[in-house]
Structures are given as C-alpha cells and as structure tokens.
C-alpha cells in the first residue's frame, strides 16, 4: 500500500539532486584552488542533514550551520555584486569581470543555484513530487531558508563599495520583498560598507530615462541612508554594450563618447 505523502504547491526536488550537488562541488573545488581542501562528500552529508527527516515547513538557519561551516569561503569583500530579479546578466557580468563575485560565484551559491529540494518529516526520503511554495505553503522551507542564510552571510561579509544590479524593466525596480530588499539590504554592515552603488539595468534599446529617479530607487536610497551607508546610482542604458565594453575595453566604440 503506497504511503500517503504531503502534497505541496511547489515543484518537487530537482531530479538527481544528490548527484548534482556532489558533481557541482567537485567541479567547483577543481576550478577554485582556494577551495581544494573541501571534502565534497562531507559537504553533501551536511547539506542532506539540513533537511532530510525534517518537516519541510520547519527548517531553521541553525539546520544549515554545519553546511555553512564547511562552505566557509573568503571572497574579496570590496568586490561583491548583489542582484535582484536580473540574475542572468549579473552572472554574465562576473564571468567577464572576473574579480567581482555574486553569491552564485561562491561554493554554496554555486551548489544550490536553480535547484529545489525538500524532505519529509521522520523519513530519510527526498521528496521529488512536490516541495513547499514560499507564498502558498510556508516560508520556512528548505530552499528559502538556505538562500536567506547564505544571502545574509554574503551581505554581512561585504565592505567598501558594494554593487547591486537591479532590473529597470520591472514595475518595482527595487522590491522590498525580494531577497535583496528583505535580507541583504538589512545585513550590510555600516561600519564596513561605505557605499551601496546600484546599477539600474535598462531593458528598452532607446530608453534614455534616468531610472535612478524611480520612486522605488528613492525608497532604497532612504533605507540605505538611514543605515548610515552612502547610496549612489548608475543607469546602464545598454547592458549588451556595457558587457561588450567590460570584455573589450580597448574597442574603439568603448573609448569614444556617444
């Protein structure tokens, strides 16, 4: 007789989740010499231990502490790029500007990027059928708590000028309910961070509006200023051109005024 299984509103665990995490860990530690000491089997065991046999609506940051400890990594604190609702461009950028890092350029972020996972209370099974949705089911689910934990730690580590890429095509360019707006903004350390520099990425080809004057950007400025951190904003009018010029700065079209 098949056991009754809780039906959640969100998609289930990504297929081949354990193999994917392990393979990503091995690949990352091969590419990044400073993380060669990491034992990927121990990393997987710690990852698994955070959510297996636990109710998927009752996960805490403490559950992830063994994984956080194993994945401790030092990135240059003044080279951090945060992003909100524009992940692909942020990742394209750090692939070109190799000295800057998004959360997904760190081991823990790389392991979990685009993956979903959850377990079941009192069984060692991974639930491949469904996992809790943040809105419809519960916020303290394995995926949400993981990203909240690593995002908080990433923001806490930042110093000097911190950059954030924001999507200028969205109705809320800055969204207080995003991970950036609800977690990272509030965990930047004013004693270490001098400035938050927002890059507003334009979507329209001929869009020359100053999106730094958007009301939601003003709201972000207000939140940041109240935390005694300086705020500044840049329009990236043509992200394709910007990326091209970061990649090939000596290109003649990147050294002449338009």
């Amino acid at each position: 007789v098949p056991r009754w299984r809780q039906q959640w509103s969100g998609p289930g665990t990504t297929k081949r989740f354990p193999e994917t995490v392990l393979a990503r860990c091995v690949k990352y530690t091969e590419i990044h010499p400073e993380m060669r000491h990491v034992d990927c089997q121990s990393v997987w065991d710690a990852f698994k231990g955070a959510f297996i046999s636990k109710h998927p609506c009752n996960i805490t940051e403490e559950d992830y502490q063994p994984l956080m400890k194993l994945g401790t990594q030092t990135v240059p604190c003044n080279k951090i790029l945060l992003w909100s609702r524009i992940k692909d461009l942020a990742h394209q950028f750090t692939q070109v500007q190799r000295d800057m890092f998004t959360l997904e350029d760190t081991l823990l972020g790389y392991l979990a990027d685009d993956l979903t996972w959850c377990g079941e209370f009192n069984t060692s099974k991974i639930n491949y059928q469904s996992c809790p949705d943040w809105r419809k089911d519960c916020s303290n689910n394995p995926v949400s708590v993981f990203w909240k934990t690593v995002s908080r730690r990433f923001a806490e580590a930042a110093c000097d000028v911190v950059h954030v890429m924001l999507n200028g095509s969205r109705s809320k360019i800055f969204d207080k309910n995003s991970t950036f707006g609800s977690v990272e903004v509030h965990n930047l350390q004013p004693e270490k961070v001098q400035t938050l520099e927002a890059w507003v990425i334009h979507g329209g080809r001929e869009d020359s509006r100053d999106l730094c004057q958007d009301p939601t950007i003003k709201e972000l400025e207000s939140i940041i200023s109240k935390r005694n951190i300086q705020f500044s904003c840049k329009n990236i009018y043509r992200p394709d051109k910007f990326l091209q010029c970061v990649k090939n700065p000596e290109d003649s079209s990147c050294t002449s005024e338009i």
Partner: antibody, heavy 120, light 110 residues
Framework: SVEESGGRLVTPGTPLTLTCTVS????????MGWVRQAPGKGLKYIGI?????NIYYANWAKGRFTISKTSTTVDLRITSPTTEDTATYFC??????????????????WGQGTLVTVSS | AYDMTQTPASVEAAVGGTVTIKCQAS??????LNWYQQKPGQPPKLLIY???TLAFGVPSRFKGSGSGTEYTLTISGVESADAATYYC????????????FGGGTEVVVK
C-alpha cells in the same frame, strides 16, 4: 562662465558662505561640484549639486559643509571653519556624457577659485 | 570608495622627451577616467576624458590610455609649457566623491 566669490579671512568657528555664480549655464541641466585645494596640496572633492537637486558630499565633508542652489548660483556654506579649511575653493561644471552603454562625467568648466583663510 | 593612486608624485623631463604618469583605481571605473592639468595660480583644466578622448583644444602630444583599474597619461615631445601638476579623476560615479582625484604628479621641465 563660472565665478566663485565670498572667500576671505575668518576666525575659527565663524560660518562662511561661498557663492558660485554661473552665466550661460542652466543649473537644471548641469551638476555643479565644489573642489578645494589647500596651499601646496592636491585637489579634494567636497560635494556636488546635481541638476535634479540631489546633493552628494564626500564622507569627510558631511556635517562640515552645506550646498544649496538658486537659479543662477550654487552656494557652499562652511558651517564651522577650522584652520584646516584654509584653501582655495573651486566651483566646476560637471558634464555627463554617454559611452560604453552607460554614462560618466567630467569637470569641464572651472572658476578661478576663491581663497579662504581661517586664522585666529 | 574609488581610491585613485597616482604615480610618480614628481617627474623631471627634458624638452622633447616623454613623460608617463600612471593612475590606478581601487575598483574598475570602466574607462571613465579624466586627466586635468593645473599650473600655479590657475584652476585645473580638463585635458582628457573617457580615458583617451582629448578635450577641445588639447594638443595631440597628450595621450591617454588604459582600462579597468589601470590608466596612463603620456606626454610626448614635452614642451616647457607642459610644466604643471597633473591629476587623474574617476568620472564613473559622481555620487562617490571620496578620493575621486589622484594625489597629483608634478612635471618639471628642464
């Protein structure tokens, strides 16, 4: 053109307002920056008034200076001068330009500067 | 901040010689680097912007180059009129003003 005025000898603690008067420049279209230079020293940015009315200060200048503007002037108030504020104060137009998919700026028009001496 | 480090602090050049001044930013400024010339008793004058674009009326013996965090001003065929102090400045973000100018390089022409 850009012209600074108001520089003079003041005693420490006496507030002083410097005025940058522009002609042929629309302050609703251009930002104006204040830069100072102590005798024999380099250039140091104090702050900037953007065309939209936003004001940015260097961290070291916060609380020590106040920038404001009218239709043809941008004022710099030194709130409580100390001897370290002895310098030539320059006002400069900031011109934004586009390149590489984004924009940047340059200080393309400077006044002659006005000398402030703080001494007891 | 975008700390701008300029080297050397002072350099001597013979008439007709070449002078090279370097400017390093603590973070990438994406080619938005300006160079200014200042003579004693005068305000600074814009020489080069966007790393390599000559400002109006500036002689072609002045050349700017570089990208990312590393920039160079080269004066070829130095003339006595080039004796001055030269400053670099980041033009990437005017909302970040601390140390946006380099410390300056004095060029002495012999």
């Amino acid at each position: 053109s850009v012209e600074e005025s108001g520089g003079r000898l003041v005693t420490p603690g006496t507030p002083l307002t410097l005025t940058c008067t522009v002609s042929g420049i629309d302050l609703n279209s251009y930002a104006m920056g204040w830069v100072r230079q102590a005798p024999g020293k380099g250039l140091k940015y104090i702050g900037i008034m953007t065309s939209g009315g936003n004001i940015y200060y260097a961290n070291w200048a916060k609380g020590r200076f106040t920038i404001s503007k009218t239709s043809t002037t941008v004022d710099l108030r030194i709130t409580s001068p100390t001897t370290e504020d002895t310098a030539t104060y320059f006002c400069a137009r900031e011109r934004e330009f586009y390149g590489g998919g984004t924009s940047g700026s340059r200080l393309d028009l400077w006044g002659q500067g006005t000398l402030v001496t703080v001494s007891s | 901040a975008y700390d701008m480090t300029q080297t050397p602090a002072s350099v001597e050049a013979a008439v007709g010689g070449t002078v090279t001044i370097k400017c390093q930013a603590s973070q990438s400024i994406y080619n938005f680097l300006n160079w200014y010339q200042q003579k004693p008793g005068q305000p600074p004058k814009l020489l080069i912007y966007y790393a390599s674009t000559l400002a109006f009326g500036v002689p072609s013996r002045f050349k700017g180059s570089g990208s990312g965090t590393e920039y160079t001003l080269t004066i070829s065929g130095v003339e006595s009129a080039d004796a001055a102090t030269y400053y670099c400045q980041q033009g990437w973000n005017s909302g970040i003003l601390d140390n946006s100018f380099g410390g300056g390089t004095e060029v002495v022409v012999k």
